[in-house]
Interface confidence: low
């Protein structure tokens, strides 16, 4: 048993049929010694008396808010949550496996630049009685500070018969150093509580590996005289790290016909303009990637040829 | 060429070569994003590599103030990785083809380090750790880790030279 926060405790249980469970001793937080009784949740049934209560925690029915009283007055509470371990593996019932970029990916994170600010998100099909708490640091043995905000519900989607909820959180490294080469990864830890079930999820990454620039902005076409060619121009996204002479991007320009089956023409360039042939009913798209480190490409910015 | 306390390097040449290094480092080990190498407990293997740290003056402001601190750190790293790529880790079994990206990478690391340091002058270099894995599979894993680390190092070096070429070239 360990303390998650004040008056909230997590009991770690090996979860299998007829498991013996865990013996837990609760102590009433009071100077009083006599006349103390214990109840669980909303029930008025007295579970025991005395300053301490010993219980055998085996299942969710044994978890909940234990309260000690004296003469009708509440003295203190202890909320017990369960953390299940099945076949030596902690349960991951609350969050959905996103399977990208690999199996058992419950948390996904992205950064728009090297400022030390990043966003993580996760999915669940649970709609109520759900709380999350996020902590982060750089390195684990001698952690350096990363400050995370509160996790918020950022999207709801219907997937077949199920509703899926996306939660996200923004974090910022306290002493970020955009120009440095990271040697210790960022660690993100999410505590998830659904009713009386506790689970924790972690992710470890370097900012450089989760970089995904915003799409290029101000994408414009300029027809070239007496030619089917056009000059495409664009600008770095506002959110990208500066100066651009240092934090440089590379770009991919694509000409795509109306039909998905049509051949795509692609040009790669480090410049913020390119000359391409504009076919009828086609569209021109541009995306960006860090010039020197192969992290994710941005989403496409597109304009129609006509 | 970068002479400590003295003249500037050939920023444009360094920029071109460092950008080539980036390309080679990724072609030598392109699928790295799909392997979480940190899960293999790499503390003892890549902890000793020289990193370009916050105080090394490799940020735009630091380069403007005095690029020598940064160039010295980059030079140390280039020599370090050049030695690693020439060591038993990469030359032993399973053997690499003579014209593999790793071989080209090795040559380019040497080329850039020579651009930064003229003959006759020696900046202190970091000792390479004695890593000689006994099993070929361990060697393979260690190669991945070293190349992964090199990708991050050369990315910072390339940014430095690109910025230098754009803002500090005579």
């Amino acid at each position: 048993i360990w303390e998650l926060k004040k008056d909230v405790y997590v009991v770690e249980l090996d979860w299998y049929p007829d498991a013996p469970g865990e013996m837990v001793v609760l102590t009433c937080d009071t100077p009083e010694e006599d006349g103390i009784t214990w109840t669980l949740d909303q029930s008025s049934e007295v579970l025991g008396s005395g300053k301490t209560l010993t219980i055998q925690v085996k299942e969710f029915g044994d978890a909940g808010q234990y309260t000690c009283h004296k003469g009708g007055e509440v003295l203190s509470h202890s909320l017990l949550l369960l953390h299940k371990k099945e076949d030596g593996i902690w349960s991951t019932d609350i969050l959905k496996d996103q399977k990208e970029p690999k199996n058992k990916t419950f948390l996904r994170c992205e950064a728009k630049n090297y400022s030390g600010r990043f966003t993580c998100w996760w999915l669940t099909t649970i709609s109520t009685d759900l709380t999350f708490s996020v902590k982060s640091s750089r390195g684990s043995s001698d952690p350096q500070g990363v400050t995370c905000g509160a996790a918020t519900l950022s999207a709801e989607r219907v997937r077949g018969d199920n509703k899926e909820y996306e939660y996200s959180v923004e974090c910022q490294e306290d002493s970020a150093c955009p120009a440095a080469e990271e040697s210790l990864p960022i660690e993100v830890m999410v505590d998830a509580v659904h009713k009386l079930k506790y689970e924790n999820y972690t992710s470890s990454f370097f900012i450089r590996d989760i970089i995904k620039p915003d799409p290029p902005k101000n994408l414009q076409l300029k027809p070239l005289k007496n030619s089917r060619q056009v000059e495409v121009s664009w600008e770095y996204p506002d959110t990208w790290s500066t100066p651009h002479s240092y934090f440089s991007l590379t770009f991919c320009v694509q000409v795509q016909g109306k039909s998905k089956r049509e051949k795509k023409d692609r040009v790669f360039t480090d410049k913020t303009s390119a000359t391409v042939i504009c076919r009828k009913n086609a569209s021109i798209s541009v995306r960006a990637q860090d010039r020197y480190y192969s992290s994710s490409w941005s989403e496409w910015a597109s304009v129609p040829c006509s | 060429r970068a002479v400590p306390g003295g003249s500037s390097p050939a920023w444009t040449q360094c920029q071109q070569l460092s950008q080539k290094l980036c390309t080679l480092a990724w072609s030598a080990h392109p699928l790295v994003g799909h392997m979480d190498l940190r899960e293999e407990g790499d503390e003892e293997t890549t902890n000793d590599v020289p990193h370009i740290q916050c105080g090394d003056g490799c940020d735009p402001q630091g380069l403007r103030d005095n690029s020598q601190f940064c160039l010295q750190r980059i030079h140390q790293g280039l020599i370090f990785y050049e030695k690693l790529l020439g060591s038993d880790i990469f030359t032993g079994e399973p053997s690499l083809l003579p014209d593999s990206p790793v071989a080209q990478l090795h040559a380019s690391l040497l080329g850039l380090s020579q651009l930064l340091q003229p003959e006759g002058h020696h900046w202190e270099t970091q000792q390479i750790p004695s890593l000689s894995p006994s099993q070929p599979w361990q060697r393979l894993l260690l190669r991945f880790k070293i190349l992964r680390s090199l990708q991050a190092f050369v990315a910072v070096a390339a940014r430095v030279f690109a910025h230098g070429a754009a803002t500090l070239s005579p």
Epitope: S115, P178 | G55
Partner: antibody, heavy 127, light 108 residues
Framework: QVQLVQSGAEVKKPGSSVKVSCKAS????????ISWVRQAPGQGLEWMGL????????YYAQKFQGRVTITADESTSTAYMELSSLRSEDTAVYYC????????????????????WGQGTLVTVSS | DIVLTQSPATLSLSPGERATLSCRAS???????LAWYQQKPGQAPRLLIY???RRATGVPARFSGSGSGTDFTLTISSLEPEDFATYYC?????????FGQGTKVEIK
């Protein structure tokens, strides 16, 4: 010329709290980190924690975790350090100290040496 | 935590003499994160050296810093009357940032 001006001396009872302020005048407050360092009479220097006034993110030394709260008010260019559950061994001079951020293009990196210090605030804890 | 041990605790010298102050770390500290401060009685500390060897603005050339890894040195080439004070080394490589216990340079 940038200066860090701290609030005046305080005498406190054991178990109470103290809140010391540190006002930056004549410079950009948000482009610095503010650390708090204390020095017991005749003793050495002890770092307590820091804040990035721009982002509001505070980081505390483990020793003071739970007892210290560092905050900043960008509008008044003032940082605060509150220490609770005071005991006699908390009697010390409390300094605020600035660490510059290297700034370029809106992003920052820390230069973690303390290049500017407040004049110090003596906090005496006595019953 | 990284422990910084300064030696000697007290250094008794005359004006004009050379002072050598040592700072030893319990584990390796990047030289980018080692600084030296001077403190006089009743005053706040003053930054002298950062990145182990760079002089802070306005610090006279007689102060110099050196070292790497676990061993760092502050040298005052020729002591001036105003240099008699307590000197602290500090690391900001790892949190918590720690200071040495100080070396007092006093007039002989």
């Amino acid at each position: 010329q940038v200066q860090l001006v701290q609030s005046g001396a305080e005498v406190k009872k054991p178990g109470s709290s103290v809140k010391v302020s540190c006002k930056a005048s004549g410079g950009t407050f948000s482009s610095n980190y503010i650390s708090w360092v204390r020095q017991a009479p005749g003793q050495g220097l002890e770092w307590m924690g820091l804040i990035d006034p721009n982002f509001g993110g505070a980081y505390y030394a483990q020793k003071f975790q739970g007892r210290v709260t560092i905050t900043a008010d960008e509008s008044t260019s003032t940082a605060y350090m509150e220490l609770s559950s005071l005991r006699s061994e908390d009697t010390a001079v409390y300094y605020c100290a600035r660490s510059k951020k290297g700034m370029y293009g809106g992003w920052t990196y820390p230069l973690m040496m303390f290049d500017l210090w407040g004049q110090g605030t003596l906090v005496t804890v006595s019953s | 935590d990284i422990v910084l041990t300064q030696s000697p605790a007290t250094l008794s010298l005359s004006p004009g003499e050379r002072a050598t102050l040592s700072c030893r770390a319990s584990q390796s500290v990047s030289s980018n994160y080692l600084a030296w401060y001077q403190q006089k009685p009743g005053q706040a500390p003053r930054l002298l050296i950062y990145y182990a060897s760079r002089r802070a603005t306005g610090v006279p050339a007689r102060f110099s810093g050196s070292g790497s890894g676990t061993d760092f040195t502050l040298t005052i080439s020729s002591l001036e009357p105003e240099d008699f004070a307590t000197y602290y080394c500090q690391q900001t490589s790892n949190t918590p940032f720690t200071f040495g216990q100080g070396t007092k340079v006093e007039i002989k």
